[in-house]
Amino acid sequence: AGVFELQIHSFGPGPGPGAPRSPCSARLPCRLFFRVCLKPGLSEEAAESPCALGAALSARGPVYTEQPGAPAPDLPLPDGLLQVPFRDAWPGTFSFIIETWREELGDQIGGPAWSLLARVAGRRRLAAGGPWARDIQRAGAWELRFSYRARCEPPAVGTACTRLCRPRSAPSRCGPGLRPCAPLEDECEAPLVCRAGCSPEHGFCEQPGECRCLEGWTGPLCTVPVSTSSCLSPRGPSSATTGCLVPGPGPCDGNPCANGGSCSETPRSFECTCPRGFYGLRCEVSGVTCADGPCFNGGLCVGGADPDSAYICHCPPGFQGSNCEKRVDRCSLQPCRNGGLCLDLGHALRCRCRAGFAGPRCEHDLDDCAGRACANGGTCVEGGGAHRCSCALGFGGRDCRERADPCAARPCAHGGRCYAHFSGLVCACAPGYMGARCEFPVHPDGASALPAAPPGLRPGDPQRYL
């Protein structure tokens, strides 16, 4: 167990041109607050996925009113740290989202209005017990400077907060087989309380006799690395020798979610869906009221005047979730045209267009014929973002620059002889056949199977094909 601590140093305009407008004005004074969301491992940073390691809201900062004509300075910040307690081992690698929120204090009907000013996200490695790590992140024209650290809560120590320490019973040394607890040299490692043989690197325990595994390890003593290879058991890999997960109790067995939360299995662990008024990895954190501002994205908080009564967030259009923290999937309406890829950026929809298309919704077919001449009288034809030339008779190739051999395809049927001609080709038909391509047989009685040859042409005469 331990606490992740975040210290915001400054939030203001970043370097470079295009300084952002101040978020507050004389007519609309406002104040800032921050939200941090932590997820274990180097997971995707989707804002909507649960904050499995925990989340925290800062206090509100001092009220700020813009000075007319002055550039936006660093804005006044809330006092104190943001603290996210974690109950289990510290994972070592984590993803974070830090959101800067503005609370407008004008004459709002129904109380203050909240809006998201900036969101930064990242993935980091961090050992518990280490020094403060400093970071700078940019979101558009804004810049956020902050420090963070993870520290263990006594009696836990170590880079993952999995070792336990106790004060020394004797002033001079620790008991037999027990080492001093670095960096707390005046304390000793507690007697081994985990299951005998439980891996000291990959396992930990919170109760005597148990052995719980860190992410990526399995087996009764947490000595078997989890394989990502396919295994046949319904819970995934099944053989301890191959490093496969052992079938048996699932992560939701016994429902680890407190306070009426419902449990669902995830590929690596479990996820609790908490009832209103509770949050945290196992729905163990309660006591949130509307005064804590639990509704995000401009949601309106109702009820929850005291910690014993649940609050309800009424979400604005386009947002959902018990805290209005999830965005509705607007891309499912497929607004992008011509095979464009839809991206919901929150403040707007964007389309990533296929080659040959452009525009906010990929609605413009780029004119591939612009500036492209087809030689020798050919005409340019557009289609699908590519251009092609429809060539005049006797020419071919991409730009109609190649002289085509009209006889190359052997167009004369029934043994007719082909002659190239300036306006096309001419077929000299074998006896018994006629037509531009010698396609019609001449019947023995002299009548053709199809209309007679044009006046002035006898069967067997060369037929010019125009």
Partner: nanobody, 120 residues
């Protein structure tokens, strides 16, 4: 300013029918995509049926063969005809539209929501 005004909805017995309509008005140059979403109690909002940017018609698997979306381009209106309704169709139904404004920008808008309740 663009408004999506919804009408229809209400209470119906399982197996019955309802028709929803949604009219878009305001500074609209063109409607790029328009359709219907729904949000059952305690669940996520999901797309039900729509006209895509390419003009195709799309439906959620759960409503195929029962719901039909149609439109009147002259009135900037879409309709959702819901037949063979089931209790699991109970939800708040939202109209949604991706609109090109006179400014040539595109914006996504939502209607106010309409309750549809299907009794077993």
């Amino acid at each position: 300013e663009v408004q999506l005004v919804q009408s229809g909805g209400g209470l119906v017995q399982a197996g019955g029918s309802l028709r929803l309509s949604c009219a878009a008005s305001g500074s609209i140059l063109s409607i790029n995509a328009m359709g219907w979403y729904r949000q059952p109690p305690g669940k996520q909002r999901e797309m039900v049926a729509g006209f895509t940017g390419d003009g195709n018609t799309i439906y959620a698997d759960s409503v195929k063969g029962r719901f039909t979306i149609s439109r009147d381009n002259a009135k900037n209106t879409v309709y959702l005809q819901m037949n063979s309704l089931k209790p699991e169709d109970t939800a708040v139904y939202y109209c949604a539209a991706d609109v090109q404004l006179f400014s040539r920008d595109y914006e996504f808008y939502w209607g106010q929501g309409t309750q549809v309740t299907v009794k077993p």
